[in-house]
């Protein structure tokens, strides 16, 4: 049974050229955390696993840096990034937990943190 | 080429054991976690045991748990799957089959080994 | 244990035309289904997963589509090669489990 609950950074946003850190915490459950995936729409960004540490995939390696913990820091930003990011948490028991952060990039200098939210 | 050939099937005892290999090559083996299923002589699929990439973590259905269980050499590119208390509804053939790397299916099978549980 | 109910079990069909195969999970399994190709002396070959990702290499005359507890499998252009057996199964939960198959065969 599905008990786990994901918290994210919610909907956020920052300024282009910038950075900025994806987090995502799981909670409410005993399972094991097999691997983390970080995923824009469908393109896999990175995974961390519990066996082999981080992986980036190639065509992020640039601009996707491992952590803190198990989130994912995005450099370099350009408008192309804003979008939905998932983080997936594969578990045993349990299986799959999704989580859904909402990134806006934005030109000026007025990018604000949204607040946090929890998803089911 | 990415390949897996599974051994160590055939014919046995109610109660007995038995040891299933399978040897993978084409692949960095000690990436990926891997899996075995098996099919019944009616065809139905049925998750058995998973282990992760390292060896450190093992899961198993609760139809085989405390009778089976999967290892794995990464120096050998092999995995087990050891089969003990065995039962006549264990008879199917056994498949190994690669985890896809983000975790979401199984890409890669082997032909599988057959395994008769019969007195 | 999340329970696949595939239908249908038996499927005719000519070369040419297009079929679809249906999976319904008897709780929400969010989009992660996978589907494999089974034929026989082949080992088996996955063609979709998370519901509608085609795995690298398949055709794209192979499509998934479906959320939460119904999805559907389809198949267009029926060629020779691509009369074979049809399984589903769900990636969301331990024990994974799958579909009881469907078997495509030509008319």
């Known amino acids: 049974m599905m008990t786990g609950t994901i918290e994210t950074t919610g909907n956020i946003s920052a300024e282009k050229g910038g950075s900025i850190i994806l987090q995502c915490h799981l909670s409410s459950t005993t399972a094991q955390v097999t691997q983390v995936n970080w995923e824009q729409q469908d393109q896999l960004l990175a995974i961390c696993n519990a066996d082999l540490g981080w992986h980036i995939s190639p065509s992020f390696k640039d601009r996707v840096a491992p952590g803190p913990g198990l989130g994912l820091t995005l450099q370099s930003l350009t408008v192309n990034d804003t979008g939905e990011y998932f983080c997936i948490y594969h578990t045993y028991p349990d299986g799959t937990y999704t989580g859904r952060i909402f990134l806006e990039v934005l030109e000026s200098s007025v990018a604000e943190h949204g607040a946090r939210f929890q998803i089911p | 080429e990415e390949q897996l050939v599974e051994s160590g099937g055939g014919l046995v005892k109610p109660g007995g054991t038995l040891k299933l290999s399978c040897a993978a090559s084409g692949f960095t083996f000690s990436t990926y976690a891997m899996s075995w299923v098996r099919q019944s002589p009616e065809k139905r699929l049925e998750w058995v045991a998973e282990?992760?990439?390292?060896?450190?973590?093992?899961y198993y259905s609760d139809t085989v748990t405390g009778r089976f269980t999967i290892s794995r050499d990464n120096a050998k590119n092999t995995l087990y799957l050891e089969m003990s208390s065995l039962r006549s509804e264990d008879t199917a053939m056994y498949y190994c089959?690669?985890?896809?790397?983000?975790?979401?299916?199984?890409?890669?099978w082997g032909h599988g080994t057959s395994v008769t549980v019969s007195s | 244990d999340v329970q696949i109910t595939q239908s249908p079990s038996y499927l005719a069909a000519s070369p040419g035309e297009t079929i679809t195969i249906n999976c319904r999970a008897n709780k929400t399994i969010s989009k992660y289904l996978a589907w494999y190709q089974e034929k026989p002396g082949k080992t088996n070959k996955l063609l979709i997963y998370s519901g509608s990702r085609l795995q690298s290499g398949i055709p794209s005359k192979f499509s998934g589509s479906g959320y939460g507890t119904d999805f559907t499998l389809t198949i267009s252009s029926l060629e020779p090669e691509d009369f074979a057996m049809y399984y589903c199964?769900?990636?969301?939960?331990?024990?994974?489990?799958f579909g009881g198959g469907t078997k495509l065969e030509i008319k």
């Open positions: 199964q769900q990636h969301n939960e331990y024990p994974w489990t």
């Open positions: 282990i992760s990439s390292g060896g450190s973590y093992t």
């Open positions: 089959a690669r985890k896809t790397l983000d975790y979401y299916a199984l890409d890669y």
